[in-house]
């Protein structure tokens, strides 16, 4: 009689994590009588899968009744795969001894690869505002796929980016894989309202890509541009000057008035008008008593945007001309951060 | 969590005995293969001993016929018993989780064995 | 048996910088080759299998290369905590498996 041969026709199996995976495995002999065992690997150090004398092997179950007598299917179904999982797996046959069974052959070893599918991307863009014109950074991380082959791409407002560099770890033979990409934007006054897109493409999502996003409402600071006016005459001896503060983003604002360098009143943006783009604009006004004063009075709008130095536009305001015939806006000036500590 | 606890170390005359225990626990361990590596006092990793899932014992010749390899897989438990033991069998010993790859990935703290006169 | 040569015996670098060693070993052992971490006073650490697969939970900063008989550990940005001794090992032919004379990484 031919001596018996274990027989693995899939050299290779391919599962989606999560779902069960079958090995096969038959024998061509039903001598020499003694049990099969499963094993992950080859070598002094391979990992007990099954085995059919004993032992708990909860995600494993046969796919044939193996105490019946003429069986010679010793197929396996492993169930809920992960990339762990993955490996070659040898389908062995022992022959009865004593004390104990004693290998008697191997089968060729079916490789097990599994398909798992990317996390949702995660887009984190920096930690500090930028201005525009200005160059930032977006990451995008994807964990936990295989194979190791996937695609990634970056849009802003639907548009493809060019710059942005990707890794793929590990280098080598992995369980599973992590992406990891940097993508450069050049911020414009226009991105209050603009979002970063990272899309994840892999065999895994049927064409259905992942998306990760950023909204560059969380990354951009639009500076405010001021304009210093002088409104007509309310009162014989009162000027109402008012300051305009405009497209600027995020909300947060303190305006400070100065008459001749000396603060007159602080005010905190709040009523605030929105434009189309998302920026914000903003007027705060001042009633001077002319009056009140002998000579010129240089009044000063300063305004602290989210945090940064202090920008501010003056206005002069002669006492000696009639109020009425006052020109708006005469040797304005912004004085840039200088005037940060007056207050 | 995956720990591995060595026991049974101390201090013993050249040509005495000792045996080494490994009390494992967090992981199925009838499933994989177990080994000793051991570490003399300021030196590098020297493999020891090897008992695969189905039994089968492998020695370095350093330690080949005097020490032997065993485990109770119902106490998850693997032991060593070293005989004959020389002074240059001083070292810590640690036990370790095989992986079917051949690499050890989890290692117990040693137990130290001294063997002087 | 597979006798595994490491390079250099000490390497001072300092924290932030790239610190990268070798293990040559003396037959091919194609991809089969792994990197521990020791330090003093605690047991080793699996880091890399198959010459550069990071083990479970290790930091993407080491990272292994090579095949056949030339294999390199590198780690791009040292931190206080890798300061230590690391050990290479064929995982090919056994027995007997074979660990390398180590890499001490000390501070500059």
């Known amino acids: 009689e031919e001596e018996l041969q274990v027989i693995q026709p899939d050299k290779s199996v391919l599962v989606a994590a999560g779902e069960t995976a079958t090995l096969r495995c038959t024998a061509t002999s039903l001598i020499p009588v003694g049990p099969i065992q499963w094993f992950r690997g080859a070598g002094p150090g391979r990992e007990l899968i099954y085995n059919q004398k004993e032992g708990h092997f909860p995600r494993v179950t046969t796919v044939s009744d193996l105490t019946k007598r003429n069986n010679m299917d010793f197929s396996i179904r492993i169930g809920n795969i992960t990339p762990a999982d993955a490996g070659t797996y040898y389908c062995v046959k022992f022959r009865k001894g004593s004390p104990d069974d004693v290998e008697f052959k191997s089968g060729a070893g079916t490789e097990l690869s599994v398909r798992a599918k990317p996390s949702a991307p995660v887009v984190s863009g920096p930690a500090a505002r930028a201005t525009p014109q200005h160059t930032v950074s977006f990451t995008c991380e994807s964990h936990g796929f295989s194979p190791r082959d996937i695609t990634l791409k970056w849009f802003k407002n639907g548009n493809e980016l060019s710059d942005f560099q990707t890794n793929v770890d590990p280098v080598g033979e992995s369980v599973s894989y992590s992406i990891h990409s940097t993508a450069k934007v050049v911020l414009t006054r226009e991105d209050v309202h603009s979002q970063v897109i990272c899309e994840v493409a892999h065999v895994t999502l049927q064409g259905d890509p992942l998306r990760g996003t950023a909204n560059l409402s969380e990354t951009i600071r639009v500076p405010p541009t001021l304009e210093v006016t002088q409104q007509p005459v309310r009162a014989e001896n009162q000027v109402n000057v008012t300051c305009q503060v405009r497209k600027f983003y995020p909300q947060r604002l303190q305006l400070t008035w100065l008459e001749n360098g000396n603060v007159s009143r602080t005010e905190t943006a709040s009523t605030v008008t929105e434009n189309k783009d998302g920026t914000y604009n903003w007027m705060s006004w001042l009633l001077v008593n002319v009056s009140a004063h002998r000579d010129d009075v240089k009044l000063t709008c300063q305004v602290e945007h989210d945090g940064q130095p202090a920008v501010s536009k003056s206005h002069d305001l002669k006492v000696s001309a009639h109020p009425k015939e006052q020109g708006s806006n005469t040797a304005a000036e912004n004085t840039g951060s200088n005037e940060r500590n007056i207050y | 969590d995956v720990q591995l606890v060595e026991s049974g170390g101390g201090l013993v005359r050249p040509g005495e005995s000792l045996r080494l225990s490994c009390a494992a626990s967090g992981f199925t361990f009838t499933n994989y293969a177990v080994t000793w590596v051991r570490q003399a006092p300021g030196e590098g990793l020297e493999w020891v001993s090897l008992?695969?899932?189905?039994?089968?014992?492998y020695y370095a010749d350093s330690v080949k016929g005097r020490f032997t390899i065993s485990r109770d897989n119902s106490k998850s438990t693997l032991y060593l018993q070293m005989n004959s033991l020389r002074a240059e069998d001083t070292a810590v010993y640690y036990c370790?989780?095989?992986?079917?790859?051949?690499?050890?990935?989890?290692w117990g703290l040693g137990t130290l064995v001294t063997v002087s006169s | 048996e597979i006798v595994l040569t490491q390079s250099p015996g000490t390497l001072s670098v300092s924290p932030g910088e790239r610190a990268t060693f070798s293990c040559r070993a003396s037959?091919?052992?194609?991809?089969?080759l792994a990197w521990y971490q020791q330090k003093p006073g605690q047991a080793p650490r699996l880091l890399i299998y198959d010459a550069n697969t990071r083990a479970t939970g290790i930091p993407a900063r080491f990272s292994g290369s090579g095949s056949g008989t030339e294999f390199t550990l590198t780690i791009s940005s040292l931190q206080s905590e890798d300061f230590a001794v690391y050990y290479c090992?064929?995982?090919?032919?056994?027995?007997?498996?074979?660990f390398g004379g180590g890499t001490k990484v000390e501070i500059k």
């Open positions: 037959q091919t052992v194609g991809s089969k």
């Open positions: 090992q064929q995982h090919t032919d056994w027995p007997p498996y074979t």
């Open positions: 370790a989780k095989v992986t079917w790859k051949n690499v050890f990935d989890y």
């Open positions: 008992i695969s899932v189905t039994g089968t014992t």
